[in-house]
Interface confidence: medium
Amino acid sequence: KKNPCNAKFQNFCIHGECKYIEHLEAVTCKCQQEYFGERCGEK
């Protein structure tokens, strides 16, 4: 199955890394230090 982090969500995480949790078919952003929020866009 394709990883959506490499397609639809390729540029979703602003200051963080896109992670795909396959067993839940879910996408999450692992934020860089000091950043938070849905897309790691808040400081």
Partner: antibody, heavy 124, light 112 residues
Framework: EVQLVESGGGLVKPGGSLRLSCAAS????????MSWVRQAPEKGLEWVST????????YYPDSVKGRFTISRDNAKNSLYLQMNSLRAEDTAVYYC?????????????????WGQGTTVTVSS | DVVMTQSPLSLPVTLGDPASISCRSS???????????LHWYQQRPGQSPKLLIY???NRFDGVPDRFSGSGSGTDFTLKISRVEAEDVGVYYC?????????FGQGTKLEIK
């Protein structure tokens, strides 16, 4: 307002079947894994099932495996639990719960939204 | 299956006093990425459960700062710094690191 509303509970005889529904509103249903949790009278909480966002993956404890089936219809913002071969020990309040939020780094942080529950009574 | 054991099961507390609930798991709740999926739920009388603390120590939205969670591995604690009347209910620890997800038996907090 984020809301989950369960329905479909009732009285059923041992060996019978029941289908529970959960209507979701106020959030993007298709982005969240969903679960069912039950609570027998005067007892604690027991996890019953979880389904992934697209419905591809489903999970059950041994106590209901092979008898219960979780499913979802993202177009209708609805979650379902088909319960077959019901037993007296399945008598409980059944809660629909959201696994959320998945976008945050803390994606898997428990069940953050719960419905009011629907009562299932299995008795002859 | 991971067995979650809470103590005490009944907790009578005087208003304004602190309260502490212990939760032990039969195996480590740390996953391969180093995350620990141990959560605490509050269920007030006649109500649905509510998420209180997620991932050991993170307070959920709107949860008062008198609630705190701590612990690691297999040993976890929920603390209430000063108990208020609205805190009456049953508190459950729960793990979602391993399938099947499991809950503790619950701790009933009541006012003395």
């Amino acid at each position: 307002e984020v809301q989950l509303v369960e329905s479909g509970g009732g009285l059923v005889k041992p060996g019978g079947s029941l289908r529970l529904s959960c209507a979701a509103s106020g959030f993007t249903f298709s982005s969240y894994p969903m679960s069912w949790v039950r609570q027998a009278p005067e007892k604690g909480l027991e996890w019953v099932s979880t389904i992934s966002t697209g419905g591809t993956y489903t999970y059950y404890p041994d106590s209901v495996k092979g008898r219960f089936t979780i499913s979802r219809d993202n177009a209708k913002n609805s979650l379902y639990l088909q319960m077959n071969s019901l037993r007296a020990e399945d008598t409980a309040v059944y809660y629909c719960a959201r696994q959320g939020p998945i976008y945050y780094g803390n994606y898997y942080y428990g069940m953050d939204v719960w419905g009011q529950g629907t009562t299932v009574t299995v008795s002859s | 299956d991971v067995v979650m054991t809470q103590s005490p099961l009944s907790l009578p507390v005087t208003l304004g006093d602190p309260a502490s609930i212990s939760c032990r798991s039969s195996q480590s709740l740390v996953n391969q990425e180093g995350e620990t999926y141990l959560h605490w739920y509050q269920q007030r009388p006649g109500q649905s459960p509510k998420l209180l603390i997620y991932k050991v120590s993170n307070r959920f939205d709107g949860v008062p700062d008198r609630f705190s969670g701590s612990g690691s591995g297999t040993d976890f604690t929920l603390k209430i710094s000063r108990v208020e009347a609205e805190d009456v209910g049953v508190y459950y620890c729960s793990q979602s690191t391993h399938v099947p997800y499991t809950f503790g038996q619950g701790t009933k907090l009541e006012i003395k």
